[in-house]
């Protein structure tokens, strides 16, 4: 007979063990890198870099890692706890509103609009009316001139389209 | 976004046989985990069958273990449950369902996903 697990007593090398077994199936939940057996009796480990498990859980089964697309960096990859996490390639940026793919960044900025954010993972460069003044320094360039974008550092976890 | 149509439904006599399909649109398919469900006239939807995105690990309720097999073809997008020994009680429409995951209760974890449903009706 197992002994009650609670998450108190589970250390990390624990969370990784292949197999979890609770003597409390009421309880009903698994740590996470794990997901619960079909009689709801034993915690079954995720597979590494295959799938993953983030919370406590009563899950079947483990969710399947991200793949990270073409045009995509790997920042760190899928733990049994933690999925992939993707980033846009330099100079490309993904939208909220369409998540599935990068995008290109804009090289620069139409006639008459200066530039006020840079090409990020997340966010195409940003233009505004020279008229309407900017958003950061006020500076306004003298001659008309496309500025071109530098591409920003900061990580975001991909999609979960894989 | 997956779009889902379940196929295979139809008359069939206690004792016979009957595999139902459920069609996915969209190239996510493998990602997600797959379920059956089903609603009789006048009772709750209820969860049958389900099996991880790979198709590797497979869950039944008791009342159709050793009679139904889930499985999928991820380079078909199609997901099938094929019916043995069907009983008069299996009579009820059919869901086909996409999600991350299934808690043990059915419920669907993370974006879910269904089809409008295939009706089966088993004679005594």
């Known amino acids: 007979e197992s002994a009650l697990i609670t998450q108190q007593d589970l250390a990390p090398q624990q969370r990784a063990a292949p197999q979890q077994k609770r003597s409390s199936p009421s309880e009903g939940l698994c740590p996470p890198g794990h997901h619960i057996s079909e009689d709801g009796r034993d915690c079954i480990s995720c597979k590494y870099g295959q799938d993953y498990s983030t919370h406590w859980n009563d899950l079947l089964f483990c969710l399947r890692c991200t793949r990270c697309d073409s045009g995509e960096v790997e920042l760190s990859p899928c733990t049994t706890t933690r999925n992939t996490v993707c980033q846009c390639e330099e100079g490309t940026f993904r939208e909220e509103d369409s998540p599935e793919m990068c995008r290109k960044c804009r090289t620069g900025c139409p006639r008459g609009m200066v530039k006020v954010g840079d090409c990020t993972p997340w966010s195409d460069i940003e233009c505004v009316h020279k008229e309407s003044g900017t958003k950061h320094s006020g500076e306004v360039p003298a001659v008309e001139e496309t500025v071109t974008s530098s591409p920003g550092t900061p990580a975001s976890p991909c999609s979960l389209s894989g | 976004e997956v779009q889902l149509v379940e196929s295979g439904g139809g008359l069939v006599q206690a004792g016979g046989s009957l595999r139902l399909s459920c069609a996915a649109s969209?190239?996510?398919?493998?990602?997600?985990?797959m379920g059956w469900f089903r609603q009789a006239p006048g009772k709750e939807r209820e969860f049958v069958a389900a099996?991880?995105?790979?198709?590797?690990?497979?869950y039944y309720v008791d009342s159709v273990k050793g009679r139904f097999t889930i499985s999928r073809d991820n380079a078909k997008n199609t997901v099938y449950l094929q019916m043995n020994s069907l009983k008069p009680e299996d009579t009820a429409v059919y869901y086909c369902a996409a999600a991350g995951s299934f808690s043990l209760g059915g419920r669907p974890y993370g974006d879910d996903y269904w089809g409008k449903g295939t009706l089966v009706t088993v004679s005594s």
């Open positions: 969209g190239r996510t398919f493998s990602n997600y985990a």
């Open positions: 099996l991880n995105w790979s198709g590797g690990s497979t």
